[in-house]
Structure formats: C-alpha cells, structure tokens
C-alpha cells in the first residue's frame, strides 16, 4: 500500500487484511459511486480472520492472526486507521488473542466477540472504550464461537453461527448491554460458520458461510419483530470467511473461500428487488478480510 495522503472522500468500503497463501497486510477501499479502488497504507502486521469496524470516522482492525511461512500467531491487536492521514496506529490490545473474531459497535464502544487462540475457542466478550483506550470483559456468550457473525440492531448485539470447536452452529444469541447478559434467539434455518452477518432495514442478514460440509450461497434474514428467519435470494457464489458490510441501503459481500478458490468477487444485494449482482472485483482473491464503511 502507498503511504501518501488518501483522497478525502466520503463513504468508502474498506477491506483490510485477509488470506491468500499467507496473511495479507493490504488496506484497500472501494468507492461504489464510481467503481474505483484505492490502495491505502498497509497494516503494520499482516492478518487474516480479523474484523473491521468504524467509530468516530476511524477504521479499527481487530484481532485475527498472522499466518506466514515464518509461523502462525493469533492476534490480540487493535489498530486504528485514520483516513485523513492514511496512517495506522496501535491501540490497547485485547485481553486475549482472537482469530476469526466478530465485532460490533454500540454507543461508540467496540465489542470483540469470540474467536480462537490456538485450539481454545472463546465464549468471552470484551468492550473497548476509544476515549480511554481500555478493554473490559463483559458477560461471556452462552456458546463458544469462532467464525462468528456479529451485528448490532436497536442497541443490542447479536452473535450468529460460528464453530464451537466441535460443531458448526445454527444457533444465535443476543447481548443486552443494560443487563450485561446473553439470551438465545431463534436458530437459523441453516448451520453457518464464517458467514457474513449485517443489519439492513431492521433485519439481521446471514449470508453464506460453511455448514461443516460445504460452502453456502444461501442467505437468510432475521426479523426481530416476528423472531423468525426467512430465506432471501442466494448469492451467485458460494463463500465462507467472506467480508460483509452495508452501504446506502445495499449489502456488499467481499471475497471469501468457495472450497476451491479464494474469491475476488464482490456482490451487492438490493432488498427492493431481492437480487444479487456482481459489482466489482477486488484486486486479488482472498478470504478472512475485515470490512467496514466510513461514515459521512
């Protein structure tokens, strides 16, 4: 990546890290308005299985691991990217390394959910306060989950699917910050680990993933009012360990692994027409990216 100043543009889709043959340090940004990609400042350490989020206009890269020819190191790191300066800076690390982590943001606080350290599959969850640069453990999940999809809706944190070390999961649970407790919600129709999970129009979407046998292209959404999961149109590509985000009322899925190939494909879901379309390609195929969108 380049170290020059990034153009000051609004609402880009950032993709950080990932895996192709080894963990990657790329940071790239896609501009849906003109279809262009920007090559930005590399992560200071390559990582895959990380998560991305945006707080206060800053992009955070959370957890993951560095799988390289020199070895394999799970990451407890939290790093912050400033789009205005095109620079990364380290923040306080989490209490434990978390590969294949999920993250969500409530009231400007980052929640780091699950993930693995070696063969330990975490059910622990911790919250980061950017103003204090501090992490604090909160109530653990009811289930150990890596490859967990995390989304926030109505100030509640949802953890969806994943792998507990033995089984891939269709279960999901919800965290209530005021009570500091987790409760199970309706299970998905499909077992999904490494799915893309996001919120759009008051529904939680779970796209793709791996059911313990195959990569999936199916997509389902959870209606919090009816507490039911319903299938929507499938993606064009089967994919697990994909990146996902929402931009201007549409869902974007990036990359992933289809069981044979590391995908460069980026698909976009339009809820009005219930259709997926190929919108662009990443500069190279990869799985396990961290994805987030900058605010206006």
């Amino acid at each position: 990546g380049s170290m020059g100043h990034a153009p000051k543009v609004g609402r880009l889709i950032y993709t950080a890290g990932g895996y192709f043959r080894q963990s990657l340090s790329y940071l790239e940004a896609y501009n849906p308005s003109d279809g262009t990609w920007l090559d930005l400042a590399d992560l200071q350490v390559p990582r895959s299985g990380l998560a991305g989020c945006v707080v206060g206009g800053l992009l955070y890269a959370v957890g993951g691991r560095n799988n390289s020819p020199d070895g394999n190191t799970d990451s407890s790191a939290l790093d912050c990217y400033n789009p205005m300066t095109n620079q990364w800076s380290p923040c306080a690390p989490m209490s434990v390394p978390r590969n294949r982590i999920g993250v969500g943001v409530i009231d400007g606080h980052i929640y780091a959910v699950g993930g693995s350290h070696g063969c330990i599959h975490h059910n622990s969850v911790e919250r980061y306060e950017p103003e204090r640069d501090e992490w604090h453990l909160v109530a653990p999940m009811l289930t150990r989950r890596i490859g967990v999809g995390v989304a926030v809706l109505n100030r509640l944190l949802y953890a969806v699917g994943g792998f507990d070390g033995t089984n891939r999961l269709n279960s999901a649970e919800c965290y209530y910050p005021e009570r500091n407790e987790w409760r199970m919600i309706t299970a998905m129709n499909t077992i999904r680990s490494g799915a893309g999970v996001c919120v759009l129009h008051n529904c939680i979407y779970a796209a793709g993933g791996y059911d313990g046998q195959d990569q999936l292209n199916s997509v389902e959404r959870y209606d919090v009012e009816t507490e039911t999961w319903t299938f929507v149109a499938p993606m064009k590509h089967r994919r697990s360990a994909l990146g996902i985000t929402v931009h201007q009322g549409r869902i974007y899925v990036l990359g992933g692994y289809d069981g044979h190939t590391f995908l460069d494909s980026v698909e976009c879901y339009d809820p009005d027409t219930d259709t997926w379309s190929e919108v662009t390609r990443m500069t190279s195929g990869r799985s396990g990216v961290g994805v987030a969108v900058t605010m206006e």
């Epitope: 070696g118 063969c119 792998f163 680990s193 313990g212 046998q213 697990s240 360990a241």
Partner: antibody
Framework: EVQLVESGGGLVQPGGSLRLSCAAS????????IHWVRQAPGKGLEWVAS????????LYAKSVAGRFTISADTSKNTAYLQMNSLRAEDTAVYYC???????????????WGQGTLVTVSS | DIQMTQSPSSLSASVGDRVTITCRAS??????VAWYQQKPGKAPKLLIY???SLYSGVPSRFSGSRSGTDFTLTISSLQPEDFATYYC?????????FGQGTKVEIK
C-alpha cells in the same frame, strides 16, 4: 467406514519434487481439516501441514514452509502434498490424517492412512 | 515451539503389569494432549484425547491424566497386544508437536 489411502511416494533425488495424494472415502474431505504427518525411519512423528476447509488457510511446519504445498480437490475427495526442493532429511513415511469427530481440543488424529514412503537420495 | 518431553524412552514390563508413561510440556498446553499407540510398520492409533478422554473402541485399561503441564498415560494391566511404541501430542498451539516416543517391550 472412514478410509485414507496415500500414494505418490518413491525415490527422488535431492532438489527434486513429488506429489503425494490422499484419497478419502467414507467422508467428504470438505467436512474436516486434513493434515500430513511424517515419520523418518526409526524416528518419531512430526506434524507437517494442514488445510482448513472453511477458510482455505494452510499451515506448515517451519521445516517445510516454502517448499511444500497442501491442497484439496473436493470433486475428487482427495488431498495433496506437493513437495519441492526435497532434501535428504525429508525422507520419511508420510501419513494423511483426519481429526477425531468426537469433541476434542485441537488435532487428535483419529484417522490415519497406511502411509507412503518418500526416499530422498542421490 | 512447545516441547513435549516424554519419559522413559523405553521400558520393559510383563503381562499384567501397570505401566505409566509421562509427557511434560515446556509450557501450558491446557488439556490439548492426545496419546497414540504405534506398532512396527503400522500407522499410529489414537488412544486418548483431551488429556483424559478415552477414544471410541479403545480398551478401558488405557487412561490419561493431567497435572499442570505433566501428562500421564497409564495401562492398568498390560496385555500382549500392548507391546508397542507410545507417543504424546500437544495441539494447544501451532505447531502441533509430539513426544519422542516410549517403546514398551516384553521383560
């Protein structure tokens, strides 16, 4: 019944290449991580490489990193170990391994192939 | 890398004897330890996983235990078919590593 059958071993000169195959039956290789473990003549066991079916990520022992490549072809239900730049110290029986389906921590290797012998010598 | 130091490297015992083999990890590996039995010319067979769980089909005379970073495989009453080499393995952290083996021979 779960079965793993390795093939492709043989005699090769230092610097040469071989591709080992591991044909699986009784389960889909897409359903479990696959590992290669080797055993030099009269010696102990050494983990070599693995591939994760969910993320596609591969892991290698430092002794083989950059020279060996693990892969899988789900349509053939077969895993492979491509071995390049072979050295005398790579001489070993190579086993293809699948972890236990039972709850365990890490890689308790429940299913082993019969092994295939790789000899690197001039 | 985590070292698994196995002892003894060999032992002689008689049928009916109680046999104990120990593995010491160079750092914490929690309970992520497995034990294998290998006979000459054959692939290893899983006996114990998660330090103390008996794998399906393995006779109950085999057992495993953990005390901190010390792991023990016990054969309560040695049978003729138990003469073999035994290996421990940690899979707590990358890379997975094995002990150097213990050969159990007939006295």
């Amino acid at each position: 019944e779960v079965q793993l059958v390795e093939s492709g071993g043989g005699l090769v000169q230092p610097g040469g290449s071989l591709r080992l195959s591991c044909a699986a039956s009784g389960f889909a290789i897409s359903a479990s991580s696959i590992h290669w473990v080797r055993q030099a003549p009269g010696k102990g066991l050494e983990w070599v490489a693995s591939i994760d079916p969910e993320t596609g990520e591969t892991l290698y022992a430092k002794s083989v990193a950059g020279r060996f490549t693990i892969s899988a072809d789900t349509s053939k239900n077969t895993a492979y170990l491509q071995m390049n730049s072979l050295r005398a110290e790579d001489t070993a029986v190579y086993y293809c391994v699948r972890r236990a389906a039972a709850k365990d921590w890490g890689v308790a290797a429940a299913y082993w192939g019969q092994g295939t012998l790789v000899t690197v010598s001039s | 890398d985590i070292q698994m130091t196995q002892s003894p490297s060999s032992l002689s015992a008689s049928v009916g004897d109680r046999v104990t083999i120990t593995c010491r990890a160079s750092q914490s590996v929690s309970s992520a330890v497995a034990w294998y039995q290998q006979k000459p010319g054959k692939a290893p067979k899983l006996l114990i996983y998660s330090a103390s769980s008996l794998y399906s089909g393995v006779p109950s005379r085999f057992s495993g235990s953990r005390s901190g970073t010390d792991f023990t495989l016990t054969i309560s009453s040695l049978q003729p078919e138990d003469f073999a080499t035994y290996y421990c393995q940690q899979s707590y952290s990358f890379p997975s590593t094995f002990g150097q083996g213990t050969k159990v021979e007939i006295k």
